[in-house]
């Protein structure tokens, strides 16, 4: 059956049961994911907006799939195997009484079972397994996966050691707070900012100081290291990633099939062999592509280059250039341009630099 073809998996709690405090729901779901991340290379991250891989839903009766709930008792929950759209989603019957303890139906225990399905596990015939088809309360403080559960999930994803990086002195993880740190590409992805460098990316969740480093291959195994440019069209849940003369399309954090494609399909002349940086401006519905000391402007609606390009970067972005490493769009009025270890906040309405920063200023360095 199917599995997630990446190790970084997002989840979102769509709505909350009134039976429990929101914090208790968050905690139960987080701990349930942790049960599986403890024994695999998988990493789970909760997002609050946008498309998550796994959507957690509390619903009663008919709720948009073929499997209407049946009132109190009977079916407690169900979850879909890995995949796009509804794939991975976990639905909990709101007609049950959800609890943190042995009364009613324990959300944590039920969630561990359902997340097992979300990750690709079927039912187990071992009555001691959490994947056994019938619900039975066990003390959640001493709860452990059975050997059968662990065998099953590790047959799909391997054990946690497979997530640990082998030392690679030629391509080791860059020091995040090195004052000379530069980035290959930067883009927003929903409420996050992705910073690419060599074979790594850092994930910065807006307004939070905490960041995490990941291997590009752990999120997108089919993508190369050394991403050179990236941009997001948030309204379409699309991210475009560029390396050399090729680009990849990521939809809802999943690579689309039939990629990479040639950058020349955008309309670049043949002499353009790579893109240095790219940024999409949703106000104008245009993407700006930066190549050496020039830039092109692409109409995403008409799917063609605007006439009159390329233009010089220095001529139209006062104080920026002649070349840039990376750029992203934020807060509805700023481009953040990266040149080596420096970063420039550029107000595209005023058409001038409003702040000069270090490239790693986003990380509280």
């Amino acid at each position: 059956g199917p599995v997630w073809r990446k190790h970084y998996i997002t989840y979102r709690i769509n709505n909350y049961t009134p039976d429990m405090n929101r914090e208790d729901v968050d905690y139960a779901i987080r701990k349930a994911f942790q049960v599986w991340s403890n024994v695999t290379p998988l990493k789970f991250s909760k997002i609050n907006t946008g498309m998550a891989d796994i959507l957690v839903v509390f619903a009663r009766g008919a709720h948009g799939d073929f499997h209407a709930f049946d009132g109190k008792g009977g079916i407690l929950a169900h979850a879909f195997g890995p995949g796009s759209g509804i794939g991975g989603d976990a639905h909990f019957d709101e007609d049950e009484f959800w609890t943190t303890h042995s009364g009613g139906t324990n959300l944590f225990l039920t969630a561990v079972h359902e997340i097992g399905h979300s990750l690709g596990l079927g039912h187990s015939s071992d009555p001691k397994a959490v994947m056994f088809p019938t619900y039975k309360y066990v003390d959640i403080n001493t709860f452990r996966l059975s050997a059968d559960d662990i065998r099953g999930i590790q047959s799909l994803y391997g054990d946690p050691k497979e997530n640990q990086r082998l030392p690679n002195p030629d391509n080791s993880e860059p020091a995040l707070c090195d004052p000379n740190l530069s980035f290959d590409a930067v883009t927003t992805v929903g409420n996050k900012i992705f910073f690419f460098k060599d074979r790594f990316f850092w994930l910065k969740v807006s307004e939070r100081p905490k960041t995490s480093v990941n291997l590009i291959s752990s999120l997108w195994p089919t993508l190369p290291s050394g991403i050179e440019a990236a941009y997001e069209i948030e309204a379409r849940n699309q991210v475009f990633l560029f390396k050399d003369d090729k680009y990849w399309l990521i939809s809802n954090l999943r690579p689309e099939p039939n990629y990479p494609k040639s950058i020349h399909s955008f309309g670049f002349p043949n002499f353009v062999k790579k893109i240095d940086a790219a940024v999409f401006n949703p106000r104008f519905y245009r993407t700006y592509f930066f190549v050496d000391n020039q830039y092109w402007r692409y109409d995403e609606r008409r799917q063609m280059m605007d006439p009159g390009y390329p233009k010089l970067i220095t001529k139209n972005f006062q104080g920026i250039g002649p070349k840039i490493d990376a750029v992203f769009y934020s807060k509805n009025k700023y481009y953040y341009f990266f040149q080596g270890s420096n970063q420039f906040e550029y107000d595209f309405l005023l058409q001038r630099i409003t702040k000069t920063l270090k490239s790693n200023s986003w990380f509280g360095c």
Epitope: M51, H63, D65, F66, P82
Partner: antibody, heavy 122, light 103 residues
Framework: EVQLLESGGGLVQPGGSLRLSCAAS????????MHWVRQAPGKGLEWVSG????????MYADSVKGRFTISRDNSKNTLYLQMNSLRAEDTAVYYC???????????????WGRGTLVTVSS | DIQMTQSPSSLSASVGDRVTITCRAS??????LNWYQQKPGKAPKLLIY???SLQSGVPSRFSGSGSGTDFTLTISSLQPEDFATYYC?????FGQGTKLEIK
């Protein structure tokens, strides 16, 4: 390349029976939910029936419940629809459609056959 | 049972126009809504799944939005090949269809 090819349609009298087949290729048939969807002449789409990957779980629209039976033979990569007690209102093009993998059906029909016409008339 | 109401039932537009079709569910279906295109004599084709995800191979002028009960299919700039009938769907329920015709 995913392909679905329906067969078995034709003209049948009211009260008669017909068995439709859908031959699948280009994917691991035994992993996927499969469905029948029909379309009466000049009308919209109507879901008819669905079956789980193993064949152990079946679902029917109220309009065909008790008259139609969906089944599958995973060794032959084939989906079936046995239609009994046919009525004039069952006249339609019948499409087979592929759904997702897994224990539950999403009703996400990503590949469709070309359809086979069933005409119920005296 | 959940009902799906699609509007309008027919629509005339010209090449290059921006077109919007809406679909309303009688109760929340979260983001579990799909859109299909069907041309005369052909099988339906999946365009958008999970309300806003573009099916592979579908041109990016098609987009979907919405969650809960209200959903929209938008074609940003109509092309000649887009004149067809469009259906929304969740589980076993299809909308009545919207026939998009050339003005």
């Amino acid at each position: 390349e995913v392909q679905l090819l329906e067969s078995g349609g034709g003209l049948v009298q009211p009260g008669g029976s017909l068995r439709l087949s859908c031959a699948a290729s280009g994917f691991t048939f035994s992993w996927y939910w499969m469905h029948w969807v029909r379309q009466a002449p000049g009308k919209g789409l109507e879901w008819v029936s669905g079956i789980s990957p193993s064949g152990g779980y079946t679902m029917y629209a109220d309009s065909v419940k008790g008259r139609f039976t969906i089944s599958r033979d995973n060794s032959k990569n084939t989906l079936y629809l046995q239609m009994n007690s046919l009525r004039a209102e069952d006249t339609a093009v019948y499409y087979c459609a592929r759904d997702i993998v897994g224990p539950y059906s999403a009703g996400l029909f990503d590949y469709w056959g070309r359809g086979t016409l069933v005409t119920v008339s005296s | 049972d959940i009902q799906m109401t699609q509007s309008p039932s027919s629509l005339s537009a010209s090449v290059g126009d921006r077109v919007t079709i809406t679909c309303r569910a009688s109760q929340s279906i979260y983001t579990y809504l799909n859109w299909y295109q069907q041309k005369p004599g052909k099988a339906p084709k999946l365009l958008i799944y999970a309300a806003s995800s573009l099916q592979s191979g579908v041109p990016s002028r098609f987009s979907g939005s919405g969650s809960g009960t209200d959903f929209t299919l938008t074609i940003s700039s109509l092309q000649p090949e887009d004149f067809a009938t469009y259906y929304c769907q969740q589980a076993g329920i299809f909308g009545q269809g919207t026939k998009l015709e050339i003005k």
